[in-house]
């Protein structure tokens, strides 16, 4: 799973780098991008890099950054207001029931059947059955022939909230 | 290594006052918010107050406003509570605690407190 | 104010089995997709100690046995396999309101 930065990864100098406030928060909430402070008096902005709130709030902190692992890809840097948006590397894929890593995608369909959809970064190469036409999941078994598929051009990021 | 050393409990009669103290060593005290957890004899964890890294804003539970305060010198690396108009149901181990975004990822050994005439 | 109940108040468990506690809060800890709860063990004798926070992710150096999951109200906090240096109480917290409060506590026992 994509690590969350934690302070103790921030060079002290990060960690202390200066606050900036705003205004009195609004009905005891603070906007995107900033939190509130222990007393309720202040909105403290998030620290670009470091960490991000993305709607009003009232909590006394801004969310972690994700830090996309090894295997995967940064699509768009965290900002204030927004989390790092993370993507498996090319030939890889994410599946909604086991989020926490990227997988190898399957080099080829299994005999009897046809790629009927690529691998992309949040689905492995599609195979149905030449005859029926009925998908096929789960581990290819060793076979003689395999149809060769190309990985998948990235399309929609898959974002991994901290 | 983080260290948290609490120092200042003991045994007051209600309406007395007392001073804690916690000595931070091992990280950069004036970068992080710190809080006061309070267990009591039943074993459970109540927050009492919290202050952020350089001390200008803090938060007292409803338990204690008013009678509690949290303070830090962060030159001296060192968080204080000062209590007043102690009454029995203060009576607890206080724990200083540092506080890590959502978590409190270090706790010091804790300091008893018995407030009993 | 957010209440955390746990349960069970106490788990009698053999070593080398799986540990199940729960948490279940009075009202939602998510904020954007984040679940704001943090577990922590407390041995005899001994301060808190974290485990978990963010609901799953694992504390530095806390051991691979520990492993937290849920979203909404609901959360559990898991060990397997238990071992002997496990018998503590545990306690989960959240920090999505203030206060943040803390759950009454499991006791972790060894059948």
């Known amino acids: 799973e994509s690590a969350l930065i934690t302070q103790q990864d921030l060079a002290p100098q990060q960690r202390a780098a200066p606050q900036q406030k705003r205004s009195s928060p609004s009905e005891g909430l603070c906007p995107p991008g900033h939190h509130i402070s222990e007393d309720g008096r202040d909105c403290i902005s998030c620290k670009y890099g470091q960490d991000y709130s993305t709607h009003w709030n009232d909590l006394l902190f801004c969310l972690r950054c994700t830090r996309c692992d090894s295997g995967e890809v940064e699509l768009s840097p965290c900002t204030t207001t927004r989390n790092t948006v993370c993507q498996c590397e090319e030939g890889t894929f994410r599946e909604e029931d086991s989020p926490e890593m990227c997988r190898k995608c399957r080099t080829g369909c299994p005999r009897g059947m046809v790629k009927v959809g690529d691998c992309t970064p949040w689905s492995d190469i599609e195979c149905v059955h030449k005859e029926s036409g009925t998908k096929h999941s789960g581990e290819v078994p060793a076979v003689e022939e395999t149809v060769t598929s190309s990985p998948g051009t990235p399309a929609s990021p898959c974002s991994l909230s901290g | 290594e983080v260290q948290l050393v609490e120092s200042g409990g003991g045994l007051v009669q209600p309406g007395g006052s007392l001073k804690l103290s916690c000595a931070a060593s091992g990280f950069t005290f004036s970068t992080y918010g710190m809080s006061w957890v309070r267990q009591t004899p039943d074993k459970r964890l109540e927050l009492v107050a919290l202050i952020n890294s350089q001390g200008g804003s803090t938060y007292n539970s409803d338990s204690v406003k008013g009678r509690f305060t949290i303070s830090r010198d962060n030159a001296r690396n060192t968080l204080y509570l000062q209590m007043s108009s102690l009454k029995s149901e203060d009576t607890a181990m206080y724990y200083c605690?540092?506080?890590?975004?959502?978590?409190?990822?270090?706790w010091g050994q804790g300091t008893s407190v018995t407030v009993s005439s | 104010d957010i209440v955390l109940t746990q349960s069970p108040a106490s788990l009698p468990v053999s070593l080398g089995q799986r540990a199940t506690i729960s948490c279940r809060a009075s009202?939602?800890?998510?904020?954007?997709?984040?679940?704001?709860i943090q577990w922590y063990r407390q041995k005899p004798g001994q301060p808190p100690k974290l485990l978990i926070y963010?609901?799953?992710n694992v504390d530095s150096e806390v051991p691979a046995r520990f492993s937290g999951s849920g979203s909404g109200t609901d959360f559990s906090l898991y060990i397997h396999p238990v071992e002997e240096d496990d018998i503590a109480m545990y306690f989960c917290q959240q920090s999505r309101k203030v206060p943040w409060t803390f759950g009454g506590g499991t006791k972790l026992e060894i059948k």
């Open positions: 009202e939602s800890v998510e904020y954007s997709g984040t679940s704001l």
């Open positions: 605690a540092r506080r890590d975004y959502e978590s409190l990822d270090s």
């Open positions: 963010a609901a799953s």
